[in-house]
C-alpha cells in the first residue's frame, strides 16, 4: 500500500511514457482551460491539422483519473455512424459501439491513460473526436476537429517558349503557388474524390530579361519552391517582328550572291565555254557548304527536325527538375 | 458550501501516536479523493498523503512513510490520519484538503490542527 | 523529488504598484497532455491557504483578474497588477506533476 510512489501518470491523466510511439501528438493545446470552474464545464473545441501517415494522440481534459466516474471518446466520421468508446471506473469496463477502424484505440488501458491514438493516419480519419470525462464536478469536454494533411507532390516544367508549368498533386487542402519573378498566370484547381486537390499554375513571360523562375508552392505540410531557366524552344512559335532580321539578313545574303554569281555568268562566260563538262558540278561544290548551313540554321526552313528536338528538351527539363 | 473541520491536535511524547480526523460537509465526499497537508511553526507547507475517493489508493511523504496512514470513512464523510512513533519534527499544524478535480492540487482547505510532538 | 525555488523571499510593495514572484522547478512541470502542472497559493497570515492560480495560468473561481500566472515547463511567475491591503500573506508555488506533491519556500508580500 503506497509502496511506489507514481509519476503522476496514475493519479493524472496521462503518462508520457505512451507516447513514444506518436509522431504527433494533440494534446498541446495554446488555449489554457477557461478561468473558473463553471466556465470549465463548457466545451473546448480545437482544430487540428494532423499529417497523413503519422501516428496522433488526443488527450482528455487535464482530469485527475482518480477523480473519474466516466470517460468516454466520441468520433464522428464522414460517411459513417458515430462511433463511441467508453470506460467506467467503478465496473473498471470498457464498451464500444459502431467502431471499426481498428487504428482508433486507447493508448494503453483507459484505467491508466485516458488518451486516444490513431496509429497511421489516413484521409479516412477527418473528422470530429470529443472526450467526455464524467467528473463529481460536473462534465469536462474537450473536442477536435481533425484535419489530416496531405503533402501535395510538387513539379515544375517548361511547356513552350517563355511558359512554365507549376503543379500541385493531391494535397490536401489545396496548395498555394506563386512564382517569382510573377509573370501573366492562370490557374487551375481539380478536386479528387478522394478528398486531394491538384492546383496547376501556368505561367508566360513576355520580359526577355527574365531567364529563371521559381515556383513557391505553400502548404499546411511544409513549403517548397523549384525553379527553371527559361530556355529559348527551337520551332517555336516566335513574333513577326522578331523573324524580321532574320528576313533582312537572308535577302541582302541572298541578293549579295546573286550578284556576285551573275558577275561570274557574265565575265567568265569565254573562260567556261573552254573547260570541261565538269563546270556545273564545281558550281555546286563552291555552293553546297553555305546551302547546308542555312538549311541546318534557319527558321524560314523546314520545322521537322525542329519539332523532335523540342520534344527531346521537354523529356530533359523534366528530368533534371525531378531531381532537385 | 465546503466545508473541511479537523480535529484531534495536542501535545504529544515523542514515540507515541496520534489520530486527526476531518469532518467533511457541502460536497459529495465519496466522490473526491482527500490530501494531509502540514505547515511546521513559522515555515513552509509540506504535503503528507493523499487517499483515492474510494480508498483504494494511498501516497505518502516519504518523511512519514511507514509511520502515518490515512484512511477515510465515507458513511461518516471523515478523513483520518492515524500518526504513529512520533517525532519532534513532526510537529506542525496538519490541514485537510480536497483534491481539486481539473489539474492535481487542493482547492478547500480545513482550519488545521496543530499537533506537538515535545517531552 | 521535484524542487521548487521561489524568489524574492520577501517582497516589500506599495500598495497600488505591481508585484512579481518567480518560480522555478527542478524539471519540467509540462504534462504531456499539453498543461503545466503548476499552482499558485496564498496564505493570509492567521489563515489556511487558499487557492488563486491552477495549471498555470488559470484563475481559480472568485480569484481577482489583478492575479494572473504564466510561465511553462520549469519557470513560472505569479504576477499582481495592483497589490492591495488584503493581498498580503505568503505566496506558495506548487507542482502537481508527481508525487510528492512539493511546494515552495514561499515569498512574504507584505506592505512596504
Known amino acids: 500500500e503506497g509502496a511506489a510512489q507514481p509519476n503522476n501518470s496514475l493519479m493524472l491523466q496521462t503518462s508520457k511514457e505512451n507516447h513514444a510511439l506518436a509522431s504527433s501528438s494533440l494534446c498541446m493545446d495554446e488555449k489554457q482551460i477557461t478561468q473558473n470552474y463553471s466556465k470549465v464545464l463548457a466545451e473546448v473545441n480545437t482544430s487540428w491539422p494532423v499529417k497523413m501517415a503519422t501516428n496522433a494522440v488526443l488527450c482528455c481534459p487535464p482530469i485527475a483519473l482518480r477523480n473519474l466516474i466516466i470517460i468516454t471518446w466520441e468520433i464522428i466520421l464522414r460517411g459513417q455512424p458515430s462511433c463511441t468508446k467508453a470506460y467506467k471506473k467503478e465496473t473498471n469496463e470498457t464498451k464500444e459501439t459502431n467502431c471499426t477502424d481498428e487504428r482508433i484505440t486507447w493508448v494503453s488501458r483507459p484505467d491508466q491513460n485516458s488518451d486516444l491514438q490513431i496509429r497511421t493516419v489516413a484521409i479516412t480519419h477527418d473528422g470530429y473526436y470529443r472526450c467526455i470525462m464524467v467528473t463529481p464536478d460536473g462534465n469536462f469536454h474537450r473536442g477536435y476537429h481533425l484535419q489530416v494533411l496531405v503533402t501535395p507532390e510538387v513539379t515544375l516544367f517548361q511547356n513552350r517558349n517563355r511558359t512554365a508549368v507549376c503543379k500541385a498533386v493531391a494535397g490536401k487542402p489545396a496548395a498555394h503557388i506563386s512564382w517569382i519573378p510573377e509573370g501573366d498566370c492562370a490557374t487551375k484547381q481539380e478536386y479528387w474524390s478522394n478528398g486531394t486537390v491538384t492546383v496547376k499554375s501556368t505561367c508566360h513571360w513576355e520580359v526577355h530579361n527574365v531567364s529563371t523562375v521559381t515556383c513557391h508552392v505553400s502548404h499546411l505540410t511544409g513549403n517548397k519552391s523549384l525553379y527553371i531557366e527559361l530556355l529559348p524552344v527551337p520551332g517555336a512559335k516566335k513574333s513577326a517582328k522578331l523573324y524580321i532580321p532574320y528576313i533582312i539578313l537572308t535577302i541582302i545574303i541572298l541578293t549579295i550572291v546573286g550578284f556576285i554569281w551573275l558577275l561570274k555568268v557574265n565575265g567568265c562566260r569565254k573562260y567556261k565555254l573552254n573547260k570541261t563538262e565538269s563546270t556545273p558540278v564545281v558550281e555546286e561544290d563552291e555552293m553546297q557548304p553555305y546551302a547546308s548551313y542555312t538549311e541546318k540554321n534557319n527558321p524560314l526552313y523546314d520545322t521537322t527536325n525542329k519539332v523532335k528536338a523540342s520534344e527531346a528538351l521537354q523529356s530533359e527539363v523534366d528530368t533534371d527538375l525531378h531531381t532537385l | 458550501q465546503v466545508q473541511l473541520v479537523e480535529s484531534g491536535g495536542g501535545v504529544v511524547q515523542p514515540g507515541r501516536s496520534l489520530r486527526l480526523s476531518c469532518v467533511a460537509s457541502?460536497?459529495?465526499?465519496?466522490?473526491?479523493?482527500m490530501h494531509w497537508v502540514r505547515q511546521a511553526p513559522g515555515k513552509g507547507l509540506e504535503w503528507v498523503a493523499i487517499?483515492?475517493?474510494?480508498?483504494?489508493?494511498?501516497y505518502y511523504a516519504d518523511s512519514v512513510k511507514g509511520r502515518f496512514t490515512i484512511s477515510r470513512d465515507n458513511s461518516k464523510n471523515t478523513l483520518y490520519l492515524q500518526m504513529n512513533s512520533l517525532r519532534a519534527e513532526d510537529t506542525a499544524v496538519y490541514y485537510c484538503?480536497?483534491?481539486?478535480?481539473?489539474?492535481?492540487?487542493?482547492?478547500?482547505w480545513g482550519q488545521g490542527t496543530l499537533v506537538t510532538v515535545s517531552s | 523529488d521535484i524542487v521548487m525555488t521561489q524568489s524574492p523571499l520577501s517582497l516589500p510593495v506599495t500598495p497600488g504598484e505591481p508585484a512579481s514572484i518567480s518560480c522555478r522547478s527542478s524539471?519540467?512541470?509540462?504534462?504531456?497532455?499539453?498543461?503545466?502542472?503548476l499552482d499558485w497559493y496564498l496564505q493570509k497570515p492567521g489563515q489556511s491557504p487558499q487557492l488563486l492560480i491552477y495549471?498555470?495560468?488559470n484563475r481559480a473561481s472568485g480569484v481577482p483578474d489583478r492575479f494572473s500566472g504564466s510561465g511553462s515547463g520549469t519557470d513560472f511567475t505569479l504576477k499582481i497588477s495592483r497589490l492591495e491591503a488584503e493581498d498580503v500573506g505568503v505566496y506558495y508555488c506548487?507542482?502537481?506533476?508527481?508525487?510528492?506533491?512539493?511546494f515552495g519556500q514561499g515569498t512574504k508580500v507584505e506592505i512596504k
Open positions: 484538503a480536497r483534491d481539486r478535480i481539473v489539474g492535481a492540487g487542493f482547492d478547500y
Open positions: 457541502g460536497f459529495t465526499f465519496s466522490s473526491y479523493g
Open positions: 487517499i483515492w475517493n474510494d480508498g483504494s489508493n494511498r
Open positions: 524539471q519540467s512541470l509540462l504534462h504531456s497532455n499539453g498543461y503545466n502542472y
Open positions: 495549471l498555470g495560468s
Open positions: 506548487m507542482q502537481g506533476l508527481q508525487t510528492p506533491w512539493t
